[in-house]
């Protein structure tokens, strides 16, 4: 078990927006004091040290030694820092992708948004929240997965062919639920078990396709922690 594995884990899909939640319990009656709050988000990448942005040296502090149950760690760096006046600083390559919701901050929600999340964003995150009279922190580990839908056999199909669609997300635990749907003009239409559609966990078996089956098919994988991912596949059935 590598250090940091014990902190809450947040999953995100590569290429999709990711929310790194931070809403610490703020023992304040007067929420107006939050306007003076400052927050600093730090990232300790899983592997491969981040390149220091020119003119933005890495934050001072100890060079972390090898953790007691893991190998050497890449240097941590400041993703984003928002001072009491809303003044922002952070690592340049990340800046356009990194957001804090200003209205959320004034309600005590210091969540960090990555739009979109990339593979290099995986790792441990810490938020230090400085209030007028106290300091609070949030810690989490961001894991990134890839979503895919595959068809077997692949490629274009002919009428009366069979096909199996497999919906997957690269996460070790199994989804708590899988919902299949079709995208029609009027929106999403759920796919139910029938002689034409056989559902088994993350698989959808169509024993005899027809040109009517052409078009986008989708699945939603939902995990026990509430994380869900929607995946689309465009099926082509020749007449």
């Amino acid at each position: 078990l590598q250090p940091g594995a014990e902190v809450p884990v947040v999953w995100a899909q590569e290429g999709a927006p990711a929310q790194l939640p931070c809403s610490p319990t703020i023992p304040l009656q007067d929420l107006s004091l939050l306007r003076r709050a400052g927050v600093t988000w730090q990232h300790q990448p899983d592997s491969g040290p981040p390149a220091a942005a020119p003119g933005h040296p890495l934050a001072p502090g100890p060079h972390p030694a090898a953790p007691s149950s893991w190998g050497p760690r890449p240097r941590r760096y400041t993703v984003l820092s928002v001072g009491p006046g809303g003044l922002r600083s952070g690592r340049l390559p990340l800046q356009p992708r990194v957001q804090l919701d200003e209205r959320g901050r004034q309600r005590g929600d210091f969540s960090l948004w990555l739009r979109p999340a990339r593979r290099a964003d995986a790792g441990e995150y810490r938020a230090a929240v400085h209030l007028r009279d106290r300091a609070l922190s949030c810690r989490l580990r961001l894991r990134l997965g890839q979503a895919s839908m595959t068809a077997s056999p692949p490629g274009s199909l002919r009428a009366s062919d069979w096909v199996i669609l497999n919906c997957s997300f690269s996460r070790p635990d199994r989804p708590a639920s899988v919902h299949w749907f079709r995208n029609r003009g009027q929106g999403r239409v759920p796919v139910r078990e029938s002689p034409h559609h056989h559902l088994a966990e993350s698989f959808l078996f169509l024993p005899q396709v027809s040109p009517m089956d052409s078009g986008p098919w989708g699945c939603i994988l939902t995990y026990r922690d509430g994380f869900n991912v929607s995946i689309m596949y465009n099926l082509t059935v020749l007449g």
Partner: antibody, heavy 120, light 107 residues
Framework: DVKLVESGEDLVKPGGSLKLSCAAS????????MSWVRQTPEKRLEWVAY????????YYADTVKGRFTISRDDVRNTLYLQMSSLKSEDTAMYYC?????????????WGTGAPVTVSS | DIVMTQSHKFMSTSVGDRVSITCKAS??????VAWYQQKPGQSPKLLIY???YRYTGVSDRFTGSGSGTDFTFTISSVQAEDLALYYC?????????FGGGTKLEIK
Amino acid sequence: DVKLVESGEDLVKPGGSLKLSCAASGFTFSSYAMSWVRQTPEKRLEWVAYVTSGGDYIYYADTVKGRFTISRDDVRNTLYLQMSSLKSEDTAMYYCTRVAYDYEWYFDVWGTGAPVTVSS
Amino acid sequence: DIVMTQSHKFMSTSVGDRVSITCKASQDVTTAVAWYQQKPGQSPKLLIYSASYRYTGVSDRFTGSGSGTDFTFTISSVQAEDLALYYCQQHDSSPWTFGGGTKLEIK
């Protein structure tokens, strides 16, 4: 060599005042948050006060709030603790400490300590 | 305030033994716990931070583990120079608080 050296008068009467200084060397003082931590005669450690690297945020333990003032002089590389309305329960060894990061609040460098005795 | 409790004030061990010191937080501090060693007549010294990361230059005989509310500090093979007071500290939120300390005695 990273060093923190505290200085200040060690014996004071109840109700009196005292100013502790901490001279820092061997690191970029202005880049670090700093803190004071005290150790009671019973060997209990108590965090006392904290100041961020830029001085934007200052925090105190409830037991000293309103009586103690932490400050820093980044030109002189010195941390201060102004103590007033001293009580016998403030008797302790006072350590100047470096905070690992402004946002990671453990103490990675400790001074040699300054003994403070509040007694009539 | 978060209360850090070290249940053993004293622990007696022999050279070469493995010894574990425990610390319990009154509320979830994720992995924000540090461990310090204070030898007689000296200032405290940081050994472990963020529950399981060894500080620069600290011997690999010292390890830390735990998350949430329960934390453990272990010395894999006790040496005579390990005679000291050991403190845990939560660095999750202010006020930053310490455990009462565990004095390690060598038989």
